[in-house]
Amino acid sequence: SEVEYRAEVGQNAYLPCFYTPAAPGNLVPVCWGKGACPVFECGNVVLRTDERDVNYWTSRYWLNGDFRKGDVSLTIENVTLADSGIYCCRIQIPGIMNDEKFNLKLVIKPAKVTPAPTRQRDFTAAFPRMLTTRGHGPAETQTLGSLPDINLTQISTLANELRDSRLANDLRDSGATIRIG
């Protein structure tokens, strides 16, 4: 499975991934990694849960949803162009080769700057030498990475508001979802 999500530099990105626990509290280990899903595990792990809790995370990466109910969607805080790429959400279902894995594409748009002093843009991996040339500065609210065909401005609510909104259901329907049990 492969879907693309977008966010703007300086904002928070949201990568949806869900499963349905067989029973309340009967959790399945999950890992998030940078780069496409390998055969086993996650490469370049940024966050991991076990049967009870989040047991490993790195700065800027967190689960904002209720992971105990199977919402293991990843939020990446204050993104840069270097966060562009493929992210692997792996639901580590017990048994041989039972894992469900999802490759999600995250595209980061450069923050726009007004006025435009030059026509040349240096789209680095934002590694340090990023130059952008137009538009407005980063939004004051933290815009979440959008689904395809959903405008960023349409979903500029804070990440924790998203969980209770109707959009959460839309994300659940079009994001990575797996039912267990």
């Epitope: 370049n44 162009l81 270097a82 595209v107 748009k109 240096d122 789209f123 680095t124 991996a125 590694f127």
Partner: antibody
Framework: QVQLQQSGPQLVRPGSSVQISCKTS????????MHWVRQRPGQGLEWIGS????????SLNQKFMDKATLTVDKSSSTANMQFSSPTSEDSAVYFC????????????WGQGTLVTVSA | DIVMTQSHKFMSTSIEDRVSITCKAS??????VAWYQQKPGQTPKLLIY???YRYIGVPDRFTGSGSGTDFTFTITSVQAEDLAVYFC?????????FGGGTKLEIK
């Protein structure tokens, strides 16, 4: 699925001009930069430049500043490159390539257009 | 312009061997290096971006490492279908530049 379909091979005279088209499908044309890359026989890859189809903003390799003209036709989701005053040194396969999105690694490539410059 | 140098034009290997291809940048490019595979008569295929990260559909045997100016692309167990030319590319600053390529051959 994403497809980039380039125009056919061309035999051109030195000093004339050559136009190559790259018709795209399977994605939102204005959401990604389109790049042009060339490969001379038995050689490496050389980035010519890129164009943002949303506003036709162009970034060109200085080496090709006076040679390459990049345009887009949004109505047909097509990118074009015109190459002026070619010499035998410009005989190469020319590729259009779509980037990942605001970062310059090239995920999708056209099949290439062979340009032969010969008198 | 940043010059990307692949010192070996050719490398010989045997099936199931481990092989590493190196690429040197003329200045610091942080971790902004991609690797491509090109088979005869085909277009380049993105394998690795930002030094370490495999693109979708790329087998686990392909890995990348390095930082700054020195980068390495490794195939941990070469398969027959891996015989191709491999290019590095910096995506740190324009103009984006490629290495000259390393052709992987069977001994």
């Amino acid at each position: 699925q994403v497809q980039l379909q380039q125009s056919g091979p061309q035999l051109v005279r030195p000093g004339s001009s050559v136009q190559i088209s790259c018709k795209t499908s399977g994605y939102s044309f204005t959401s990604y930069l389109m790049h042009w890359v060339r490969q001379r026989p038995g050689q490496g890859l050389e980035w010519i430049g890129s164009i943002d189809p949303s506003d036709s903003e162009i970034s060109l390799n200085q080496k090709f500043m006076d040679k390459a003209t990049l345009t887009v036709d949004k109505s047909s989701s097509t990118a074009n490159m015109q190459f002026s005053s070619p010499t035998s040194e410009d005989s190469a396969v020319y590729f259009c390539a779509r980037d990942f999105g605001y970062v310059a690694w090239f995920v999708y490539w056209g099949q290439g257009t062979l340009v032969t410059v010969s008198a | 312009d940043i010059v990307m140098t692949q010192s070996h034009k050719f490398m010989s290997t045997s099936i199931e061997d481990r092989v590493s291809i190196t690429c040197k940048a003329s200045q610091d490019v942080s971790a902004a290096v991609a690797w491509y595979q090109q088979k005869p008569g085909q277009t380049p295929k993105l394998l690795i971006y930002s030094t370490f990260y495999r693109y979708i559909g790329v087998p686990d045997r392909f890995t990348g490492s390095g930082s700054g100016t020195d980068f390495t692309f490794t195939i941990t167990s070469v398969q027959a279908e891996d015989l191709a030319v491999y290019f590095c590319q910096q995506h740190y600053s324009v103009p984006w530049t490629f290495g000259g390529g390393t052709k992987l051959e069977i001994k």
